[in-house]
Each structure stands twice: as structure tokens, then as C-alpha cells.
């Protein structure tokens, strides 16, 4: 089918984009769509004494309900939406008047949709329309046995024994403009290494320090040993799963899918089939013996509520095939449209370097929030979140961590996946405004019950204070309950209280806690806050109180199912400008709850930022006397000295972002 | 846009000689593994050479192990095949393949080995 023409009647203005529909271009291409007009009732040369009304030109994107309009050019003049700076031109105008061809930059997958371009002249309007697909998916790939084993040959076959081939540059920038973040570093096709990190941390810094982009190694010696990214294309064909009660075994996932009319899938097929919506709550063998499962919809239950293509592991460090005695179900492939390169075709065999990739696509809605963490490129110890529990890698070993996979025996893991989403850095430099120095904060001292923020830790999470409102005491038992909820926690426990006290944490304000009791944790007894307790360090109760009268409650956040972010511009915020601001960058405010938790896990900033309460505060994980006072712990700024008061929502701050 | 554009097919007798051509654009050709495949009439693709993106390691089929020859020019995104002492059951559709998707090869190039 070629391009959709509409105009109201036939002697008026034609607008024609002389292309097929849909129009199929690989990721990290560029793409020029050609669109021409007629307009037989204007005609270009009109009297010198009058002033020619130039035709309008806008092209727009449609896609999932949603237009953009990406540029409009009238009188020789081009308007570029600003989100498409250096993305989208007239190649041809304003030197042919009449030529609104377009032309689109390092295509995403985002880029897909359906192109319209309008001509408005007078009173007339005209349009015709193209849809573009853009194809194909990066991925990283790492062979089974540990990180960084493969030079640029091994690596090359790792993707076309996969139904892939190496990525390109262009198409790893495009993926990261997807949203694409995995800290390992990896091969691509004109022989450099390169990776792509959206929220720069200690190891995965490279050549870039504190900013966002892809990192690079530059052009490296064929025989270094890195992972790879790859880069599947398309299929024509179809992956589906196989089962039976008992599951099968490598061979007989193999022989099932054969009677079946169809092969074991790839890797880059499955990809493929994940990136087309496909989801699949059980793990199967594919056809390089790794076992993995793709998951479009994130769920609790189903590889710790993350998307992408998970793998299952033998051991904890993530390494090691399932035996290929073990049962899981059969992804099959069927179509004619890839043929199996024989392993003497690279002039080995075996499985020395059969490979598994890591990673999770970001830039999908999720209805929760997202589990986000990362490995190193080059080695440190990963904090990560809500596993049903965890090891504390060495430094030799990949840095992920791993949660049950689902049907599983008890011996396999299910990666988590070595990714974090796009978030919004501080641009590079501190701004000025209100300096959590100068501002009253209070003196919370919120120790993480079971360990000190960059520490390896068990499970646990963090008992916090809350008064969410500008007035102390206020919170009846039931609004304490939904307080801690709306802040993305729950109320906390005497049992989790009493482990916070004992990992230091102090606070003398009464709070609600989970069996109606009500207690505050003292390290340190001074006069008004002795409590039941004397001069003795120790939780101090009120006992079970009526549910009708008011404190402040403790809240219990379990583990970050996200990635808090800070954000900035010059002029900061508003509280109104922060919601706005963060979801116009697929995320929200952060919830208090999510701010102590990424607190939990390392995220220190001596900038006071909005939260989703209307609360201002600040994390700080490494105290030094600027960054409000010597203990670590999440600063809160109140209006008044005794600590009361939220501050005004038209005063301009920083905020902090979830997503 | 990546294409692949095959040449040097032809009719030919036992015991001669073809060299296949393959002109490569739209992809970096120097970083990437090339390969000849070839698909005789009513039968499966089968796999013939493949070439490293250096050039420095290349490998055979055995059916046409010692006759055939894989050859690169990075220079000019060029692939080889040297073809000597052709047989009848050489006659095929003769594809340039850097992946394994059929649908990113080239159009192919007929070699018919006749007498």
C-alpha cells in the first residue's frame, strides 16, 4: 500500500509521499521520507503587489494515540520541536519550495509511528501519511562461564550463532537513546568496546566521568577479551513455547520441537519475539542449552518484577547451564528465514564459550515499579533490590544479582536484569538555591536495619520516620497506615523498629507502628525523650492506643523496585513544575519511602529536592558539616525551627525523580 | 541499507573454474564475518566458507575443502570465491551471507558445473 492523499477536492492542494507503507529501517539508521505538493490554486509566482500566503508545512509523528509534532515551515523558516533538535530536517526546503521531503537521524525504536505530513495553504489542507517501522533490538551477550571472555572473533559468532550479528555503534547509541544501560563493556562491529550508562556510578564511569552517554574503549586489539552487544534484526517466522506436564530435557525440548515442524529458537529470536510482546511466566531451553524466559508484563511472581529476556543460572554467581537433564519447557522456532551456521564454520566446537546475555529494555510502561540495578564494567560491589535474597559477589565474578526463577527447582536462579532506565542527571553541576545548609532539616538519624549504605547486605530494608503533613503528631492509626502506603512503604513492625534501634537508628517522636503500638527508638536518653524507660537506652512504648489518637508513624521500606533520580535545571522547580517535570521523563516524584530506600543504597546529594508529599529533603549517605549536620540519613527541610512546617509549594527547588 | 550484490555465476564445465564476487555496502564490512551459502534445486541451503573480519582464519565445508577458496578486500567491501576443479554436484544458487538471516543475503548468483 503507498502513502494515504487527502484534499478536499480535486483542483486543490496535493500532498504525496511516493513510498511504500509500512516502510521496514534497522535501528540506528537514518531515514529520509520523501513528501511533494501541488498546490494548482497558488502557483508560486504571483504580482510583485501582493504578498504570496506561503504555504505551511508540518510533519508529525502518530504513535500509540499520541501525536508529536515534529517541525512546522512556513516562509522559508523551519520550526524544530526542541526534542527534535539535530533529529529531523528539510533537506530540500526552503531551496525547492514545494519539497517537504524529511529526513530523521540515528533512528530508535521509539522513532516508529505513523509520519504525516501537512500541507496548510490558505485555507486549504492537504496530508499524506507513511508508517515506519523501525526494526530490530541490541542486546548484550557474555559467555556462560565468566564476564569478559570473548575476543572480536567469538564474539562475532556469539551473535550469528544467535541469529544476530554484531551491533554497530550507531545502533548501540540508539538503543541508549531507548533507554538501553548495561555497565559491561562489549564488542561492536567496527572493533571498539563500548557501553551504554544512563546514570553514571563509581565503575561504570569510563571516558565519560559523571555524564550520561555510550562509554568507550576506542578501537581494541582483536584478541582482548570482552562481552558483546549484538544487534537481531527481524524474523519472519514464529517463536512458541512447547510443554508438557513433565517438561523436557535439552533433548528431548529439541526432538519436541522438531516433531513439532520447528526448531529450538535462539536467543536472538526469542529477543525478537519479547520485543513483539511476547511473555511467558516459564522458563525453556533454547538452542544453545541456556534456559531463559521472556517477560513483556512485569509481575512479582515472575522474575522479580522486571521485563526483558531473563536467563536461568546453575549457580548463584550466575554462571553455568541447568543440566541438560533438567526439565523446563521448549521455545521452538518455525520459519525459513534463518539457517544455522555449523559450529566448524568458526573453526571450533564445543561449548567453551556459548553465551548468555543480560539485560532488560526500559521505556515500557510497567504496572510497578521497576527493579534497576547494575553490574560494573570494571568491578565493585552492587547494592541491589528486592531479591529474595542475595550474595555479595566478588570482584572476579559478575556483579549481578538473582532472584528464583519461576517452575524452577531450588538449585537455578533467574538473573536480575544489568540495567537501569534513562534518568535525568544534574546536567553536571550543583545549582544554586536553597543549600540544605541554611535550611532547618531535621536530625533523623535512619540506619538501614540490617546494613550501613554500601555494604552487601541480607534481606531487610529500612525503618523510617514519617510525618507527612506540616504539624507534628497528627495521624490517626488508619491515616498512618495509608501514609507509609502513599510514600511506597508500609507501617513498620515493633520487631523491624527494634532491629533499626539496634543498628543505631534514634528518634524521639512517637509513631504508630503495625499492632497499634506506639514507640520511639532512643540511643541516647535525654530529658524529653525518656519515655518508659528512664535513663536506659531502648524502644520506649505507649502501649496498644486507642486508634483514634494522633502521632507521627514508622514506616518500613522494603527494597527500591526502581531507580530514584535527581533532577535540576537552572531555575529549579516548583513543586507543580517537579511533578510535571518527571513525567515528562516516564517517571514520578519519588515517594519519601523511595528516597530513604535508594538512600539505603548509596544515593548521597547535598541538594534538597521535592518529593511526591510536597515534602523537601535530601539524602546524605557520607555526612560532612555542610550536608546538614554529622550523622548520615534523609534530610528533611522544615519551615520552622521546631521542625514543622512544609515549605511553600511556588518556592523553586530540585526534586527527585522514580522510575 | 545494507546490500549484497553477487556476480561471476556461469555455466562451466567439470573441472574448471569460477570467482565469485560480492560487493558489500551499507554495513561495516571490515568488522564482520562473511560467508558463501549455496542451494542446489529441491535441496536445503548449505553452508560453504566463512571468513573472519580480518581475514586471518577461514573455513570449509568439507565437500569443497582444497577447491574452494574464501578471500576478503577490506579495501574495496569485497568478498571472494575462488572455485577450481568444479564438479556437477557444485551447480547451485551461490549467496554472500554475513548473518544468518535469508533475508539479509544477496540475490545470488547461479554457477552451473556441466559438460
Known amino acids: 500500500a503507498v502513502t494515504v492523499e487527502t484534499s478536499d477536492h480535486d483542483n486543490s492542494l496535493s500532498v504525496s509521499i511516493p513510498q511504500p507503507s509500512p516502510l521496514r529501517v534497522l535501528l540506528g539508521t537514518s531515514l529520509t521520507i520523501p513528501c511533494y505538493f501541488i498546490d494548482p490554486m497558488h502557483p508560486v509566482t504571483t504580482a510583485p503587489s501582493t504578498a504570496p500566503l506561503a504555504p505551511r508545512i508540518k510533519w508529525s509523528r502518530v504513535s500509540k494515540e499520541k501525536e508529536v509534532v515534529l517541525l512546522v515551515a512556513t516562509e522559508g523558516r523551519v520550526r524544530v520541536n526542541s526534542a527534535y533538535q539535530d533529529k529531523v530536517s528539510l533537506p530540500n526546503y526552503p531551496a525547492i519550495p514545494s519539497d517537504a521531503t524529511l529526513e530523521v537521524q540515528s533512528l530508535r525504536s521509539n522513532d516508529s509511528g505513523v509520519y504525516r505530513c501537512e500541507v496548510m495553504h490558505g485555507i486549504e489542507d492537504s496530508e499524506a501519511t507513511l508508517e515506519v517501522v523501525v526494526k530490530g533490538i541490541v542486546f548484550h551477550y557474555r559467555a556462560i562461564s565468566t564476564r569478559y571472555t570473548l575476543d572480536f572473533d567469538r564474539a562475532q559468532r556469539a551473535c550469528l550463532q544467535n541469529s544476530a550479528i554484531i551491533a554497530t555503534p550507531e545502533q548501540l547509541q540508539a538503543a541508549y537513546e531507548d533507554g538501553f544501560h548495561q555497565c559491561d563493556a562489549g564488542w561492536l562491529a567496527d572493533q571498539t568496546v563500548r557501553y551504554p550508562i544512563h546514570t553514571p556510578r563509581e565503575g561504570c564511569y569510563g571516558d565519560k566521568d559523571e555524564f550520561p552517554g555510550v562509554r568507550t574503549y576506542g578501537i581494541r586489539d582483536t584478541n582482548e577479551t570482552y562481552d558483546v552487544y549484538c544487534f537481531a534484526e527481524e524474523m519472519e517466522g514464529e517463536v512458541f513455547y512447547a510443554t508438557s506436564p513433565e517438561k523436557f530435557t535439552f533433548q528431548e525440548a529439541a526432538n519436541e520441537c522438531r516433531r513439532l515442524g520447528a526448531r529450538l529458537a535462539t536467543t536472538g529470536q526469542l529477543y525478537l519475539a519479547w520485543q513483539a510482546g511476547m511473555d511467558m511466566c516459564s522458563a525453556g531451553w533454547l538452542a544453545d542449552r541456556s534456559v531463559r524466559y521472556p517477560i513483556s508484563k512485569a509481575r512479582p511472581n515472575c522474575g522479580g518484577n522486571l521485563l526483558g529476556v531473563r536467563t536461568v543460572y546453575v549457580h548463584a554467581n550466575q554462571t553455568g547451564y541447568p543440566d541438560p537433564s533438567s526439565r523446563y519447557d521448549a521455545i521452538c522456532y518455525t520459519g525459513e528465514d534463518f539457517v544455522d551456521i555449523p559450529e566448524n564454520f568458526f573453526g571450533v566446537g564445543g561449548e567453551e564459550d556459548i553465551t548468555v546475555q543480560t539485560v532488560t529494555w526500559p521505556d515500557m510502561e510497567l504496572p510497578l515499579p521497576r527493579n534497576i540495578t547494575e553490574g560494573e564494567a570494571r568491578g565493585s560491589v552492587i547494592l541491589t533490590v528486592k531479591p529474595i535474597f542475595e550474595v555479595s559477589p566478588s570482584p572476579l565474578e559478575p556483579e549481578e544479582p538473582f532472584t528464583f526463577a519461576p517452575e524452577i527447582g531450588a538449585t537455578a536462579f533467574a538473573e536480575v536484569e544489568n540495567e537501569t532506565g534513562e534518568a535525568t542527571r544534574p546536567w553536571g553541576f550543583p545549582t544554586p538555591g536553597l543549600g540544605p545548609a541554611t535550611a532547618f532539616t531535621s536530625e533523623d538519624l535512619v540506619v538501614q536495619v540490617t546494613a550501613v549504605p554500601g555494604q552487601p547486605h541480607l534481606p531487610g530494608g529500612v525503618v523510617f520516620h514519617y510525618r507527612p503533613g506540616p504539624t507534628r503528631y497528627s495521624l490517626t492509626f488508619e491515616e498512618a497506615q495509608q501514609a507509609c502506603l502513599r510514600t511506597g512503604a508500609v507501617i513498620a513492625s515493633p520487631e523491624q523498629l527494634q532491629a533499626a534501634y539496634e543498628a543505631g537508628y534514634e528518634q524521639c517522636d512517637a509513631g504508630w507502628l503495625r499492632d497499634q503500638t506506639v514507640r520511639y527508638p532512643i540511643v541516647s536518653p535525654r530529658t524529653p525523650c525518656v519515655g518508659d524507660k528512664d535513663s536506659s537506652p531502648g524502644v520506649r512504648t505507649y502501649g496498644v492506643r486507642p486508634s483514634t489518637e494522633t502521632y507521627d508513624v514508622y514506616c518500613f521500606v522494603d527494597r527500591l523496585e526502581g531507580e530514584v533520580f535527581f533532577a535540576t535545571r537552572l531555575e529549579q522547580f516548583t513543586f507543580q513544575e517537579a511533578l510535571e517535570f518527571c513525567e515528562s521523563h516516564n517517571a514520578t516524584l519519588a515517594t519519601t519511602g523511595q528516597l530513604y530506600a535508594a538512600w539505603s543504597r548509596g544515593l548521597d546529594k547535598c541538594y534538597a529536592g521535592w518529593l511526591a508529599d510536597g515534602s523537601l529533603r535530601y539524602p546524605i549517605v557520607t555526612p560532612r558539616p555542610a550536608c546538614g549536620g554529622d550523622k548520615p540519613g534523609v534530610r528533611t527541610v522544615y519551615l520552622y525551627p521546631n521542625q514543622t512546617g512544609l515549605p511553600d509549594p511556588l518556592s523553586r527547588h530540585h526534586a527527585f525523580c522514580f522510575r | 541499507e545494507v546490500q549484497l550484490v553477487e556476480s561471476g555465476g556461469g555455466l562451466v564445465q567439470p573441472g574448471g573454474s569460477l570467482r565469485l564476487s560480492c560487493s558489500a555496502s551499507?554495513?561495516?564490512?571490515?568488522?564482520?564475518?562473511m560467508f558463501w551459502v549455496r542451494q542446489a534445486p529441491g535441496k536445503d541451503y548449505e553452508w560453504v566458507a566463512s571468513?573472519?573480519?580480518?581475514?586471518?582464519?577461514?573455513y570449509y565445508d568439507d565437500s569443497v575443502k582444497g577447491r574452494f577458496t574464501i578471500s576478503r578486500d577490506s579495501a574495496k567491501n569485497t568478498l571472494y570465491l575462488e572455485m577450481n576443479n568444479l564438479k556437477p554436484e557444485d551447480t547451485a544458487l551461490y549467496f554472500c551471507?554475513?548473518?544468518?538471516?535469508?533475508?539479509?543475503w544477496g540475490q545470488g548468483t547461479q554457477v552451473t558445473v556441466s559438460s
Open positions: 551499507g554495513f561495516t564490512f571490515s568488522g564482520s564475518w
Open positions: 571468513i573472519n573480519s580480518s581475514g586471518g582464519r577461514t
Open positions: 551471507a554475513r548473518s544468518p538471516r535469508v533475508g539479509s
